[in-house]
Interface confidence: medium
C-alpha cells in the first residue's frame, strides 16, 4: 500500500506519485508550433523563450504523514503553479488570458523531474518506526497536456520495513511487531 | 520524569457522551505525540485516537465521526470527547505520549488508563 496522498499537518494535500496539482481552468492556448503553422503574424515574443512563461516552482516544507505516523523531520517539496503563457501577456488580477489562436494545444505547468528521498516515518504507542521512500517533485515545467496526463501514470513506492535504531529501549506498554503492524493498518 | 493523569472515565448508557482528559507533568519536548488507546478484556491494545503537537489528528475507523480528540499545548493536556458511545467502546482507556528530538523517539509514556463502560 502506497501513499497516495500524503497530508501535511495543516491537512494540505500532497499529490502522491504520477499526479500533480491541477492548475484552474485556463483559456490559455499556445502558438508557435509547426504542426500549427509557425508563429503568427507580427507576434514579437518567442514562445519557446523559457523566460517569458510564468510556471513557478513553489517550495513547501512540511511533515508528511501517513494515518498516525509522521516523518520525523519534515520534507520539502516543489510544487508546480502558475499560466503557461508569455510573462508580458498574463494579467495583473485575477481574470482570464485570450490568446491569438483558440485551438491550439493546452501547455500546463507540471511536474518534469522527480527525485526520490527516503523518509523515515514515527509511529505513535509504541511502534516500531519505519521507513518509505517517496518521490517528490524537483522541477517544475510548461509542457503540452495529453490525454495521459489526466490518468496516474506511475506508481508509488512500496512501504519498506526501517532497521530498528540503535540503543532504541523497549517502552512500556509495547506490542509486538504483528500487533503494531495490524493496528497502523487498521488506523488508516 | 513525566506523568500523565487521566480522568473523565464511568459508566455511560449506549448514545451517551463522556469526555476524557490526560494531563502531562514534567519535562516535555515541544515536538511531540498524544493519543488515546483502549484495551477490551482479552483484547489487544488499539489506538483510537492520536494528535501531534502541530495539530495533525488520526482516528481509528471504528471512532471516526463520534470521538474527537484535542489538546492544549500549554496546560500540556489531550482530551477526548467520546459521543454516541456503544457497548463495543468499553474498554480501559490509556493516555500515550511520546516525545521526538532531532528526528528520533525521546521518550514514551503511558499512563495509568481510566475505564469507561457502555451498559444500559
Known amino acids: 500500500q502506497g501513499w497516495q496522498a500524503f497530508r501535511n499537518d495543516a491537512t494540505e494535500v500532497i499529490p502522491g506519485l504520477g499526479e500533480y496539482p491541477e492548475p484552474p481552468p485556463e483559456n490559455n492556448q499556445t502558438m508557435n508550433r509547426a504542426e500549427n503553422g509557425g508563429r503568427p503574424p507580427h507576434h514579437p515574443y518567442d514562445a519557446k523563450d523559457v523566460s517569458e512563461y510564468s510556471c513557478r516552482e513553489l517550495h513547501y516544507t512540511r511533515f508528511l504523514t501517513d494515518g498516525p505516523c509522521r516523518s520525523a523531520k519534515p520534507v520539502t517539496e516543489l510544487v508546480c503553479s502558475g499560466q503557461c503563457g508569455p510573462a508580458r501577456l498574463l494579467p495583473n488580477a485575477i481574470g482570464r488570458v485570450k490568446w491569438w489562436r483558440p485551438n491550439g494545444p493546452d501547455f500546463r505547468c507540471i511536474p518534469d523531474r522527480y527525485r526520490a528521498q527516503r523518509v523515515q516515518l514515527l509511529c505513535p504507542g509504541g511502534a516500531a518506526p519505519r521507513s518509505r521512500k517517496v518521490r517528490l517533485v524537483a522541477s517544475c515545467k510548461c509542457k503540452r497536456l495529453t490525454r495521459f496526463h489526466n490518468q496516474s501514470e506511475l506508481k508509488d513506492f512500496g512501504p519498506e520495513t526501517a532497521r530498528p535504531q540503535k540503543g532504541r529501549k523497549p517502552r512500556p506498554g509495547a506490542r509486538g511487531a504483528k500487533a503494531n503492524q495490524a493496528e497502523l493498518e487498521n488506523a488508516y | 520524569e513525566v506523568q500523565l493523569v487521566e480522568s473523565g472515565g464511568g459508566l455511560v448508557q449506549p448514545g451517551g457522551s463522556l469526555r476524557l482528559s490526560c494531563a502531562a507533568s514534567g519535562s516535555i519536548f515541544s515536538d511531540n505525540v498524544m493519543g488515546w488507546y483502549r484495551q477490551a478484556p482479552g483484547k489487544q491494545r488499539e489506538l483510537v485516537a492520536t494528535?501531534?503537537?502541530?495539530?495533525?489528528?488520526n482516528y481509528a475507523d471504528s471512532v471516526k465521526g463520534r470521538f474527537t480528540i484535542s489538546r492544549d499545548n500549554a496546560k500540556n493536556t489531550v482530551y477526548l470527547q467520546m459521543n454516541s458511545l456503544k457497548p463495543e467502546d468499553t474498554a480501559v482507556y490509556y493516555c500515550?505520549?511520546?516525545?521526538?528530538?532531532?528526528?528520533?523517539?525521546?521518550?514514551?509514556?503511558w499512563g495509568q488508563g481510566t475505564q469507561v463502560t457502555v451498559s444500559s
Open positions: 500515550n505520549l511520546g516525545t521526538i528530538v532531532t528526528g528520533t523517539w525521546r521518550s514514551d509514556y
Open positions: 494528535i501531534w503537537s502541530s495539530g495533525h489528528t
